[in-house]
Interface confidence: medium
């Protein structure tokens, strides 16, 4: 499905279902009353029981491109987050103190993400070729780490998933994560003519020019994110079910599980040729700029039950549900969003010609 041609005064769309059925998990048991191993107890953890976590370096993928951000005043968000494995960033949360620029000064930058996309104002850029993905079809083994990091659900990807934005601009995938809303409330990060979609997937990549995330942060083109909107459709999405069926396993903040490998490309739209492109930032602290964003025009369809499961299965810090984990859209500040395809003529009689006021700037892309 393509992005809707919406009028400026269109009400925001919702995508969650009202279903109360729990997510049925065929593949893994859920944590109805999970018998877990306890870490050495700390006062702040009791009486909760946490799973053992693997030790990692000081800078973790979940500290960086999980790509979320502060709350929209019109979308109250309640998800305080502090990564218990040791955040690289100071404490931050959606929709509350501290202001993100205090957490990371880059969050006050001029070229931040997400943004509102207005297709009619995008610059058609024929040089934007279909994306090329290599190695995204993963075998079942080895298993992958799926983690509730308190502000999203994140799948850590193995080496070997390669993506090219163009000749000589190669990237490897690091992780993917989702953004969502709540029952009756959409939760995508990017919007299209003000329309917020039920959810959004981000696949975060690092340029092959850099060996480590720290080196790529803030460098132009150092990181690249593929983004797609998730919408409600009539059928279950079997690719997403391979992740969603494990959510009850990681209901608690900080918990993780192992999931079989899957075809990561199946989580993205089938049409990789029609997309919007702009330069922005990570959407959570550290909000590093220079991130190349690719937002697909085609949406991905999930069933109402799947969208409901996504928005209702996880918990953030304390007793708060992990919901509405998106950042308010940021001003373009003169940036031009490019499109790999010409804007379509509206079906309404008054729209005779596509109105594209901007020209393609990145001819060599």
């Amino acid at each position: 499905q393509r992005l809707p041609r919406m009028q400026e005064d269109s009400p925001l769309g919702g995508g969650s279902s009202g279903e109360d059925d729990p997510l049925h998990e065929e593949d893994l048991p859920s944590e109805e009353d999970p018998p877990r191993e306890e870490d050495p107890p700390r006062e702040e953890d009791l009486p909760e029981v946490k799973p053992k976590s693997e030790e990692e370096g000081s800078l973790k993928l979940e500290d960086l491109p999980t790509v979320e951000a502060p709350g929209d005043p019109q979308e109250p968000q309640n998800n305080a987050h502090r990564d218990k494995e040791g955040d690289n960033q100071r404490h931050w949360r959606y929709g509350g103190d501290p202001p993100w620029p205090q957490v990371s000064p880059a969050c006050a930058g001029r070229f931040q993400s997400p943004v509102d996309i207005r297709p009619q104002l995008a610059a058609f850029c024929p040089a934007l070729r279909p994306l090329e993905l290599l190695g995204f079809e993963l075998p079942l083994l080895p298993e992958l780490r799926l983690r509730n990091n308190g502000h999203s659900v994140q799948l850590t990807l193995p080496s070997g998933l390669e993506m090219a934005l163009g000749p000589g601009r190669e990237y490897r995938a690091l992780q993917l994560h989702l953004h969502w809303g709540a029952v009756g409330r959409p939760g995508s990060e990017h919007t299209v003519e003000g329309h917020r979609f039920p959810a959004e997937i981000h696949v975060v990549h690092i340029s092959t020019a850099y060996a480590r995330v720290e080196e790529a942060l803030g460098r132009p083109g150092g990181l690249a994110v593929l983004a797609a909107f998730l919408e409600e459709g009539p059928e279950e999405n079997s690719a997403y079910e391979q992740l969603l069926s494990h959510l009850e396993e990681i209901a608690e903040e900080g918990s993780e599980t192992q999931v079989p490998g899957l075809d990561v490309s199946a989580l993205l739209p089938s049409d990789l040729s029609r997309y919007f492109r702009y330069e922005g930032s990570l959407t959570t602290p550290p909000c590093a700029q220079g991130v190349i964003w690719t937002v697909f025009n085609q949406t991905v369809m999930l069933s109402a039950k799947q969208l409901h499961a996504l928005s209702d299965a996880l918990w953030g810090p304390g007793d708060s549900r992990l919901q509405l984990n998106f950042r308010v859209t940021q001003p373009l500040n003169g940036r031009v969003i490019e499109a790999s395809f010409p804007a379509e003529v509206d079906s309404s009689p008054r729209a005779a010609e596509p109105v594209q006021l901007n020209s393609c700037l990145a001819a060599g892309d």
Epitope: P29, E31, P35, P51, E249, Q258
Partner: antibody, heavy 119, light 107 residues
Framework: QVQLVESGGGLVQPGGSLRLSCAAS????????MSWVRQAPGKGLEWVSY????????YYADSVKGRFTISRDNAKNSLYLQMNSLGAEDTAVYYC????????????WGQGTTVTVSS | EIVMTQSPATLSVSPGERATLSCRAS??????LAWYQQKPGQAPRLLIY???TRATDIPAKFSGSGSGTEFTLTISSLQSEDVAVYYC?????????FGGGTKVDIK
Amino acid sequence: QVQLVESGGGLVQPGGSLRLSCAASGFTFSSYSMSWVRQAPGKGLEWVSYISSSGSTIYYADSVKGRFTISRDNAKNSLYLQMNSLGAEDTAVYYCARHRSYRFALDYWGQGTTVTVSS
Amino acid sequence: EIVMTQSPATLSVSPGERATLSCRASQSVSRGLAWYQQKPGQAPRLLIYSASTRATDIPAKFSGSGSGTEFTLTISSLQSEDVAVYYCQQYNKWPLTFGGGTKVDIK
């Protein structure tokens, strides 16, 4: 072919401890989640404990929580079950079993090792 | 925890006849159900997973059906080598739980 061989069972007094081992071969051990399942004499099967492929996620049955500890050494292709504060109700054949890579059934089982708790 | 109840406790079937074993869950387990065969003195062997999918090298005479709370294992033509105890197991919610077993023998 896939092989799971348990060892470490024996006779132990109530309150005592035992450490069971399971040696795995014929597959990439570090890629599979594992469980211990036990069977009391003449009884049915009872799941005891689970450990994910990396060891990052662990579960226990309520009946053994706080007394048993599951662990694995992927470098040695070995699974372990440390059993403390044993009681007569823990007398059973203990099987180590491999979880399927995708669905969560147990596709390969060892032949079991017998643990007898008696004074 | 989810309680799995198998019936009958013992099933005697004539050679070549069909054996039908039932397993009921105390609450829905979707299709997160497996069947195992355990012969005397041996370890259990996986027959069926996801309620109806035969495991590797399991002959077609074994079939599974059902979802939610009611499940059935069918042995289409019972032979002497099928004499065993059959267990169902749910893996939809922790803790993993097994049924009490159905002992199948030859009439």
